[in-house]
């Protein structure tokens, strides 16, 4: 669900976290229609979430705690 | 109707450990996450921890990091809290509440609670 | 010490207008939705308001919620005697804190 590296809507599904290597995020005022998590795959995917969702939030948070503790 | 329904009270002597089930009924149990929250007598909501089934994940509060043990049962839809090494300042209403995976991160139905003590 | 902070009591008449605050930061409420919830004493905390100013089903409209910036209230109007009980507001935290956060609580007390 996305058109020039923007996210136009958002995955209706959960992912797993031990699939996802990271993230990066989309905020509207800035060039884009939406805000959103953009989750990159081992893949190579990357897949539009909303990031006002649980999951979401949780993923990020473990994502981010990973990253510090490197 | 959708419930959550906590174990009954215990009472522990202090450096001993306690675990409190949450059972829940109805709603599928891989769609919440379930938190875990204290209440000392007479104080405030305290966070503890939360335990996300679908993820096989559980996330400690800073407080509460090296002590507490959160699980889940898939099978009987149910969740543990359990916390060693215990002083009386454990003492509290220990509540169970589940958060919706797919929605807003607020607490829709909370277990009746238990009610720990810790006392030599 | 609670990351939001409540003032510690609220009072009221019957019929009267309560507004409660909650305050935060750019890290919790300035970037999430706030809840509210109701603990009448010797029970449970209950859902009375999430995404900042939606009410559950079964909640009476005299409770509403909003949020500006890193603030965020909940207002009673039309007090009635069985609105006395503790209130707390909550939301997520996006620091690499506890993501779940609490305010102290606010005794609402109806004169």
């Known amino acids: 669900a996305s058109n020039f590296d923007c996210c136009l809507g958002y995955t209706d599904r959960i992912l797993h976290p031990k699939f996802i290597v990271g993230f990066t995020r989309q905020l509207a005022n800035e060039g884009c229609d939406i805000n959103a998590i953009i989750f990159h795959t081992k893949k190579k995917l990357s897949v539009c979430a909303n990031p006002k969702q649980t999951w979401v939030k949780y993923i990020v948070r473990l994502l981010s705690k990973k990253v510090k503790n490197m | 109707e959708v419930q959550l329904v906590q174990s009954g009270a215990e009472v522990r002597k202090p450096a001993s450990s306690v675990k409190v089930s949450c059972k829940t009924s109805?709603?599928?149990?891989?769609?919440?996450?379930f938190n875990w929250v204290r209440q000392a007598p007479g104080q405030g909501l305290e966070w503890m921890g939360s335990?996300?089934?679908?993820?096989?994940?559980?996330d400690y509060g800073q407080n509460f990091q090296g002590r507490l043990t959160i699980t889940a049962d898939e099978s009987t839809t149910t969740a543990y809290m359990e916390l060693s090494d215990l002083t009386p300042m454990d003492t509290a209403i220990y509540y169970c509440?589940?958060?919706?995976?797919?929605?807003?991160?607020?607490?829709?139905?909370w277990g009746q609670g238990t009610l720990v003590t810790v006392s030599s | 010490q609670s990351v939001l902070t409540q003032p510690p009591s609220a009072s009221g008449t019957p019929g009267q207008r309560v507004t409660i605050s909650c305050s935060g930061g750019?890290?919790?409420?300035?970037?999430?939705?706030v809840n509210w919830y109701q603990q009448v004493p010797g029970t449970a905390p209950k859902l009375l308001i999430y995404l900042s100013d939606q009410r559950p089903a079964g909640v009476p409209d005299r409770f509403s919620g909003s949020k500006s910036g890193t603030s965020a209230s909940l207002a009673i109007s039309g007090l009635q005697s069985e609105d006395e009980a503790d209130y707390y507001c909550s939301t997520w935290d996006d620091s690499l804190n506890d993501p779940v956060v609490f305010g102290g609580g606010t005794k609402v007390t109806v004169l």
């Open positions: 509440a589940r958060v919706a995976m797919v929605g807003a991160t607020h607490f829709d139905i």
């Open positions: 750019s890290s919790n409420i300035g970037s999430n939705p």
């Open positions: 109805g709603g599928s149990f891989n769609d919440y996450s």
């Open positions: 335990i996300i089934p679908v993820f096989d994940m559980a």
